[in-house]
C-alpha cells in the first residue's frame, strides 16, 4: 500500500493517525498552536510528513473548506520564484509579495498569502498513512 518515491501520490491509503484528518488518499494535520515557518516544517518532518504541498486547484479548494480567516503555513517558498517543498513550481494559483521579506507561503479560506517566514502561524502537515511511505 501507498508505495512510491518520496514525492509520489499515495495509492489506496487506509486510516490516518490520531488527530490527523483523512482526505482522499492523504492524511492532513491542522495545528492548534502557532510556529514560524521553519519550526512548522520541523514539526511535520519529525512526524514523517511535510508541510502541505498542494497538487492542484481541486485539492486547494477542498482544503480551504476546513480553513478559517487565520493563515496556515504550507510548504511553499519564494526562492527565485514560488516553489513547493517538493521542488515543483506554483502553477495553478497566484501569490504575490508586497515586500522583500515575504518569502514563505500561507493559506486561509480565501487563498494564498505571502508572509515573512518569522510570523507565528498555524500550519498544515500532509502525509501518507504509513510513516515510511510517500510524503506528498
Amino acid at each position: 500500500l501507498c508505495q512510491g518515491s518520496n514525492y509520489s501520490t499515495c495509492a489506496s491509503c487506509p486510516s490516518c493517525p490520531d488527530r490527523w484528518m483523512k482526505y482522499g488518499n492523504h492524511c492532513y494535520y491542522f495545528s492548534v498552536e502557532e510556529k514560524d515557518w521553519n519550526s512548522s516544517l520541523e514539526f511535520c518532518l519529525a512526524r514523517d510528513s511535510h508541510l502541505l504541498v498542494i497538487t492542484d486547484n481541486q485539492e486547494m479548494s477542498l482544503l480551504q473548506v476546513f480553513l478559517s480567516e487565520a493563515f496556515c503555513w504550507i510548504g511553499l517558498r519564494n526562492n527565485s520564484g514560488w516553489r513547493w517543498e517538493d521542488g515543483s513550481p506554483l502553477n495553478f494559483s497566484r501569490i504575490s509579495s508586497n515586500s522583500f521579506v515575504q518569502t514563505c507561503g500561507a493559506i486561509n479560506k480565501n487563498g494564498l498569502q505571502a508572509s515573512s517566514c518569522e510570523v507565528p502561524l498555524h500550519w498544515v502537515c500532509k502525509k501518507c498513512p504509513f510513516a515510511d511511505q510517500a510524503l506528498f
Epitope: 508586497n98 515586500s99 522583500f100 521579506v101 515575504q102 515573512s116 518569522e118 510570523v119
Partner: antibody
Framework: EVQLVESGGGLVKPGGSLRLSCAAS????????MSWVRQAPGKGLEWVAT????????YYADSVKGRFTISRDNAKNTLYLQMSSLRAEDTAVYYC?????????????WGQGTLVTVSS | DIQMTQSPSSLSASVGDRVTITCRAS??????LAWYQQKPGKAPKFLIH???TLAEGVPSRFSGSGSGTDFTLTISSLQPEDFATYYC?????????FGQGTKLEIK
C-alpha cells in the same frame, strides 16, 4: 487599540549619543516588524531603520548605517534606537512605526514622535 | 536606490473639489506603493497600500491608482479635514523611500 509611545528624545551635542524607546501596546508585539522613521523640522519623512520579528535581521538607511542600532525586547514590548556619533542633520522628530502584518512593510501605525535636537 | 518624486509640491483647492496628486518612481516598482496623510504637529496617517488598497477606516473619497512608475492619489470631493500634506512611499525593498510630500492647502 494599537498604541506606540516614543520617549528618550532631547538635546544632545554633536558627537553625542542618545537612546530612544518605543513602548508598544494593544497588539502582539512579537508578531510584527518594527521601524523608525524621522522628520527633520519643516522637511519630509525619511525611513531610518527596520527590525525583524526576532530581531535577527536589521536594515538601515545609508545616512545612519554604522552610527544607529535598532533593537527590540519582545518580552518588554519595546523597540529601541541607539544613536551615536550624532550630527546636526540628525535633528528630527523620530517616529516608531509598526508594519501591516505578515511582513507587509508599509507603516500602518505610528507613534506621536519624540524630538531629537543635535546642537552645540 | 529607487527615488520617489511627487507633484505638485503644493496645491490649493476648495472644499468639494476633486484633487489628484502624482507620485513617480525612478524605476518600475509594480504596485509597491503606499500613501500617507500628515497634519501639522501630528504623526502621519496610513491611507493606502499596494497602490490602490484603502487602509481600514479611510473614507471612500480617497482612491489610489497606477502601477509601474506612475501613481496617483485622488480625493473625489475635498472635505475640510483633508487639508494636509500627503506622502507616497515605496514599500517593497530597502531603502523604503518617501516622496518629498505634497501640501494641500485651502484656496
Amino acid at each position: 487599540e494599537v498604541q506606540l509611545v516614543e520617549s528618550g528624545g532631547g538635546l544632545v551635542k554633536p558627537g553625542g549619543s542618545l537612546r530612544l524607546s518605543c513602548a508598544a501596546s494593544g497588539f502582539t508585539f512579537s508578531r510584527y516588524y518594527m521601524s523608525w522613521v524621522r522628520q527633520a523640522p519643516g522637511k519630509g519623512l525619511e525611513w531610518v531603520a527596520t527590525i525583524s520579528i526576532s530581531g535577527g535581521n536589521t536594515y538601515y538607511a545609508d545616512s545612519v548605517k554604522g552610527r544607529f542600532t535598532i533593537s527590540r525586547d519582545n518580552a518588554k514590548n519595546t523597540l529601541y534606537l541607539q544613536m551615536s556619533s550624532l550630527r546636526a542633520e540628525d535633528t528630527a522628530v523620530y517616529y516608531c512605526a509598526r508594519e501591516g502584518g505578515y511582513g507587509n512593510l508599509w507603516f500602518a501605525y505610528w507613534g506621536q514622535g519624540t524630538l531629537v535636537t543635535v546642537s552645540s | 536606490d529607487i527615488q520617489m518624486t511627487q507633484s505638485p509640491s503644493s496645491l490649493s483647492a476648495s472644499v468639494g473639489d476633486r484633487v489628484t496628486i502624482t507620485c513617480r518612481a525612478s524605476e518600475n516598482i509594480y504596485s509597491a506603493l503606499a500613501w500617507y496623510q500628515q497634519k501639522p504637529g501630528k504623526a502621519p496617517k496610513f491611507l493606502i497600500h499596494n497602490a490602490k488598497t484603502l487602509a481600514e477606516g479611510v473614507p471612500s473619497r480617497f482612491s489610489g491608482s497606477g502601477s509601474g512608475t506612475d501613481f496617483t492619489l485622488t480625493i473625489s470631493s475635498l472635505q475640510p479635514e483633508d487639508f494636509a500634506t500627503y506622502y507616497c512611499q515605496y514599500h517593497y525593498g530597502i531603502p523604503f523611500t518617501f516622496g518629498q510630500g505634497t501640501k494641500l492647502e485651502i484656496k
